[in-house]
C-alpha cells in the first residue's frame, strides 16, 4: 500500500517552489492538462549556456513524513537532447541531481539551508533514458522518463526534496513522494493494523477480530516488509467465541442466528439446535432445553436435551415361598437417552393392615436401585404379608425433574407359613416286611400341625412308580409291605392349615432278613 | 517581428454576432497557448477565454460561457473569438495575449501574458 | 474565485518609490504577475512570478508577494511610469486568469 506525501498532478494551485539563486535561466513553473483535461503544474529549466559551476536549484515545499522512515519519490520528467538545441554549448547536461533535507519543522528559506551538498543529503544523480528531439519549428518529440528513487532513512518531523540542474533543458513533469506501508490486513480472524515499516522487516502484533478469542499457542504475529508487503507465514491466528462462526474469508465472527448454537471456540459453524431445545436470541454458545426437557451434567452442551423416560410397563410378578421374582417391559418413553436404570420402592402390609415401608430384612437381587436389567429377585418375605411394589424407570435427568415419578406398581400376597421340614426320623421297630418310624413334633407357626406325609421308596428303584405315600394324623408311621433286607429312603412332611410343609432330609431304613429276630426297637 | 495583431471589432446591435481575429507572427504559434482580454471603457481588463496550443482544451469566464467561442488554426496563425448574442456589456476593447511558452514542450504554459495585441473595440449598441 | 484588489489610485513623486498592492486570500501562496498599461496601448509585462524582471524592463520596477499582499515597487520613479498597473494571478477554474481593478500611479 502506497501512501501519498506529495503529488503534484492532484496539486491545483501553484506550486511556488523555492528556486535559487534569483538569476535568468531558473527553473519556471508551467501549467497544463492532463488526460482528464485537470491543470497539472510542471517546472521546466533550459539554461544550456551558463556560466561554469552555475547551478540551478528548485526546492519543493516542507513535507511532512508521516512516520514514514523510507521515502520514495517517483519524477516523471522529460530530457531535451543537447544535441537538439543550436546554442548548446559544453556546459549542457542530460543528468539533474536529486537530494533532500530534513528538519522537524518548515524553517528553510531563500537562502538557508545552505544550497549545496551536505547539508543537502544527495539521493542520486539522474540520467534520462529518453531524450526528447527538436527540430526548429517541429514539435518535440521523445518518451516521458520515470524513475523512482529511495530516500531515507529519515528521522526528522518532515523534509525538502530539491532538484539540482547543471546545464540541462528538461522539464519536471510530475513529482510524487510516496510511503510504503502494510494495509491493514484481517487473516485467520486475526487483525494486523496498517504498519509503516521502520526496518527491512517489523514483526507485527496481531489481535483477534471482535468475537473471537486468542487460539492456544503463541499470540499471533506477522512481518511487515520494507516493500509494503507483508512476508507469507502461517499465523495461529484466532478462533470465533463460543456462539459464534467465521465469516467473509474468516476476517470476521458471525453471531450464530437464531435457532443455531456454538458450543465452542474454534473451527466449526454454527449448527441446528439439537432436539427438544431452541435458542431465541443471536450468538448462542448453548440452547435452552424446552420446558420439561433436561440435560445432565455430564451432558455435552450441544447434547439433545432428554426428559425422565415414563413407567416401566407389564411387571409380571411369580412367588415361590418367601421369594419373589419380579419382571416387566421397558418403559414406552425413554425420553432420549440410553442411560435407563430401575428402582424398586416397597411397602408392607401386616395381616392385621397395618402398613410401612419394608424392613431390612427384604434382600433384593442384584440390588433395589440402579437395575440395568429389568427383573429383580425379593428374598425374605414374611408369609401372610401384602407387599406393593413400585417400579420406576429413571434416567440422567430423572434428578432434574420436579414432580411424581411415573411407576408400575405390583401387590403380592405371599401364603400364611407352612410347617418346616421334618427331620429326626427314628425306626423305632423294624421286621422283614415293616419299618415303624416315629419323629419328633415340627412346631408351626401357623396353627397346629393337621396331619403329615410320608413319602418312601426302595433305595435304587428311582421311577416315580416305586414311590409310596402314607398319611398319618400322629408324629409316626408304619410302613408295611416292604420287602426283606431291603433299604429304604424316607422322607416326612407336615401340614397345617397353611398347607404342606417342606419334605426332610432322606432317612435310611433297612428291613429285618429273617422272621425270628421278631419285632427289634430300633434307636435312631 | 513578434506581434499579434486584432481585427474584427465594429459596431452590433445587441443580440448580434462577431468574430474577431488574431494573426500571430514571429514566433511558433502552435507551441503557444492564447488568451482573449478585454477592458471596458475607462475599467480594467478582464480575462474572457484560453486556448491551448493544439486547440483541443478551451477555457471562460463566467460572464461569456455559452455565448462565445474561442478557436485556432495553427496552420494560419490566427487566434479567433466568436461571439454570439452580444449585450451591451459586452463593449470593450478585446485583446489577443500569448501565455508565456515553455522550452519546448507546447503541453505546458506559464501563467503570465508576455504579449498583446493592440486590441480592437467592439461596440454593442442599438 | 479569488479576488483581487488594488488601490484605485498612487500618487508618488518623480525619484520617489511607489508601491502599488495588490491583496487577496493567501495570495502569497500564488504567483502574482504586474501589467503596465498606458493610456490607449495594449498591457505590457513587468513583473512575472512574484519577483522577476522580462527582458527590457528597467531594474527599478521590482516584485514581492507573502502573506496576502503582492506589491509592485517602482524605486526612482520616473514621469514616463505613470500608466495604470494591474496585477494577475490563477482563478480557481481550469486555467482561467484573474485580474485586480488596476491602480492608476500618478507621477507628481
Known amino acids: 500500500l502506497e501512501e501519498t506525501l506529495l503529488n503534484t498532478k492532484l496539486e491545483t494551485a501553484d506550486l511556488k517552489w523555492v528556486t535559487f539563486p534569483q538569476v535568468d535561466g531558473q527553473w519556471e513553473e508551467l501549467s497544463g492538462l492532463d488526460e482528464e483535461q485537470h491543470s497539472v503544474r510542471t517546472y521546466e529549466v533550459c539554461d544550456v549556456q551558463r556560466a561554469p559551476g552555475q547551478a540551478h536549484w528548485l526546492r519543493t515545499g516542507w513535507v511532512p513524513r508521516r512516520g514514514a522512515v523510507h521515502v520514495y519519490a517517483t519524477l516523471r520528467f522529460t530530457m531535451l537532447e543537447c544535441l537538439s538545441l543550436p546554442r548548446a554549448g559544453r556546459s549542457c547536461k542530460e543528468t539533474f541531481t536529486v537530494f533532500y533535507y530534513e528538519s522537524d519543522a518548515d524553517t528553510a528559506t531563500a537562502l538557508t539551508p545552505a544550497w549545496m551538498e551536505n547539508p543537502y543529503i544527495k539521493v542520486d544523480t539522474v540520467a534520462a533514458e529518453h531524450l526528447t528531439r527538436k527540430r526548429p519549428g517541429a514539435e518535440a518529440t521523445g518518451k516521458v522518463n520515470v524513475k523512482t528513487l529511495r530516500l531515507g532513512p529519515l528521522s526528522k518531523a518532515g523534509f525538502y526534496l530539491a532538484f539540482q540542474d547543471q546545464g540541462a533543458c528538461m522539464a519536471l513533469l510530475s513529482l510524487h513522494l510516496f510511503y510504503k506501508k502494510c494495509a491493514q490486513l484481517t487473516v485467520n480472524l486475526t487483525r494486523f493494523p496498517e504498519t509503516v515499516p521502520r526496518e527491512l522487516v517489523v514483526p507485527v502484533a496481531g489481535s483477534c477480530v471482535v468475537d473471537a478469542v486468542p487460539a492456544p499457542g503463541p499470540s499471533p504475529s506477522l512481518y511487515c516488509r520494507e516493500d509494503g508487503q507483508w512476508a507469507e507465514q502461517p499465523v495461529t491466528g484466532c478462533s470465533c467465541a463460543p456462539g459464534f462462526e467465521a465469516a467473509e474469508g474468516n476476517t470476521k465472527c458471525r453471531a450464530c442466528a437464531q435457532g443455531t448454537f456454538k458450543p465452542l471456540s474454534g473451527e466449526g459453524s454454527c449448527q441446528p439446535c439439537p432436539a427438544n431445545s431452541h435458542s431465541n436470541t443471536i450468538g448462542s454458545a448453548v440452547c435452552q432445553c424446552r420446558v420439561g426437557y433436561f440435560r445432565a451434567r455430564t451432558d455435552p452442551r450441544g447434547a439433545p436435551c432428554t426428559t425422565p423416560p415414563s413407567a416401566p410397563r407389564s411387571v409380571v410378578s411369580r412367588l415361590n415361598g418367601s421369594s419373589l421374582h419380579l419382571e416387566w417391559s421397558a418403559p414406552l418413553e425413554s425420553g432420549g437417552r440410553e442411560d435407563l436404570t430401575y428402582a424398586l420402592r416397597c411397602r408392607e402390609c401386616r395381616p392385621g393392615g397395618s402398613c410401612a415401608p419394608c424392613g431390612g430384612d427384604l434382600t433384593f437381587d442384584p440390588g433395589p436401585r440402579d437395575l440395568v436389567e429389568p427383573w429383580v429377585v425379593v428374598r425374605g418375605l414374611r408369609p401372610d404379608f401384602t407387599y406393593t411394589f413400585e417400579v420406576t424407570a429413571l434416567n440422567g435427568v430423572s434428578s432434574l425433574a420436579t414432580g411424581p415419578v411415573p411407576f408400575e406398581p405390583v401387590n403380592v400376597t405371599t401364603d400364611r407359613e407352612v410347617p418346616p421340614a421334618v427331620s429326626d426320623i427314628r425306626v423305632t421297630r423294624s421286621s422283614p416286611s415293616s419299618l415303624s418310624l416315629a419323629w419328633a413334633v415340627p412346631r408351626a407357626p401357623s396353627g397346629a400341625v393337621l396331619d403329615y406325609e410320608v413319602k418312601y421308596h426302595e433305595k435304587g428303584a428311582e421311577g416315580p412308580s416305586s414311590v409310596r405315600f402314607l398319611k398319618t394324623s400322629e408324629n409316626r408311621a408304619e410302613l408295611r409291605g416292604l420287602k426283606r433286607g431291603a433299604s429304604y429312603l424316607v422322607q416326612v412332611r407336615a401340614r397345617s392349615e397353611a398347607g404342606y410343609g417342606p419334605f426332610g432330609q432322606e432317612h435310611h431304613s433297612q428291613t429285618q432278613l429273617d422272621e425270628s429276630e421278631g419285632w427289634r426297637e430300633q434307636l435312631a | 517581428q513578434v506581434e499579434l495583431v486584432e481585427s474584427g471589432g465594429g459596431l452590433v446591435q445587441p443580440g448580434g454576432s462577431l468574430r474577431l481575429s488574431c494573426a500571430a507572427s514571429g514566433f511558433t504559434f502552435n507551441n503557444a497557448w492564447m488568451s482573449w482580454v478585454r477592458q471596458a471603457p475607462g475599467k480594467g481588463l478582464e480575462w474572457v477565454s484560453a486556448?491551448?496550443?493544439?486547440?483541443?482544451?478551451?477555457s471562460y469566464a463566467d460572464s461569456v460561457k455559452g455565448r462565445f467561442t474561442i478557436s485556432r488554426d495553427n496552420s494560419k496563425n490566427t487566434l479567433y473569438l466568436q461571439m454570439n448574442s452580444l449585450r451591451a456589456e459586452d463593449t470593450a476593447v478585446y485583446y489577443c495575449?500569448?501565455?508565456?511558452?515553455?522550452?519546448?514542450?507546447?503541453?505546458?504554459?506559464?501563467?503570465?501574458?508576455?504579449?498583446w495585441g493592440q486590441g480592437t473595440l467592439v461596440t454593442v449598441s442599438s | 474565485d479569488i479576488e483581487l484588489t488594488q488601490p484605485p489610485s498612487v500618487s508618488v513623486a518623480p525619484g520617489q518609490t511607489a508601491r502599488i498592492s495588490c491583496s487577496g486570500d493567501n495570495l502569497g501562496k500564488k504567483y502574482v504577475h504586474w501589467y503596465q498599461q498606458k493610456p490607449g496601448q495594449a498591457p505590457v509585462l513587468v513583473i512575472y512570478y512574484d519577483s522577476k524582471r522580462p527582458s527590457g524592463i528597467p531594474e527599478r520596477f521590482s516584485g514581492s508577494n507573502s502573506g496576502n499582499t503582492a506589491t509592485l515597487t517602482i524605486s526612482g520613479t520616473q514621469a514616463e511610469d505613470e500608466a495604470d498597473y494591474y496585477c494577475?494571478?490563477?482563478?480557481?477554474?481550469?486555467?482561467?486568469?484573474?485580474f485586480g481593478g488596476g491602480t492608476k500611479l500618478t507621477v507628481l
Open positions: 494577475q494571478a490563477w482563478g480557481a477554474g481550469s486555467h482561467q486568469m484573474v
Open positions: 486556448i491551448n496550443a493544439k486547440g483541443q482544451f478551451t
Open positions: 495575449a500569448r501565455k508565456g511558452m515553455s522550452f519546448y514542450n507546447n503541453k505546458y504554459a506559464k501563467s503570465m501574458f508576455d504579449l
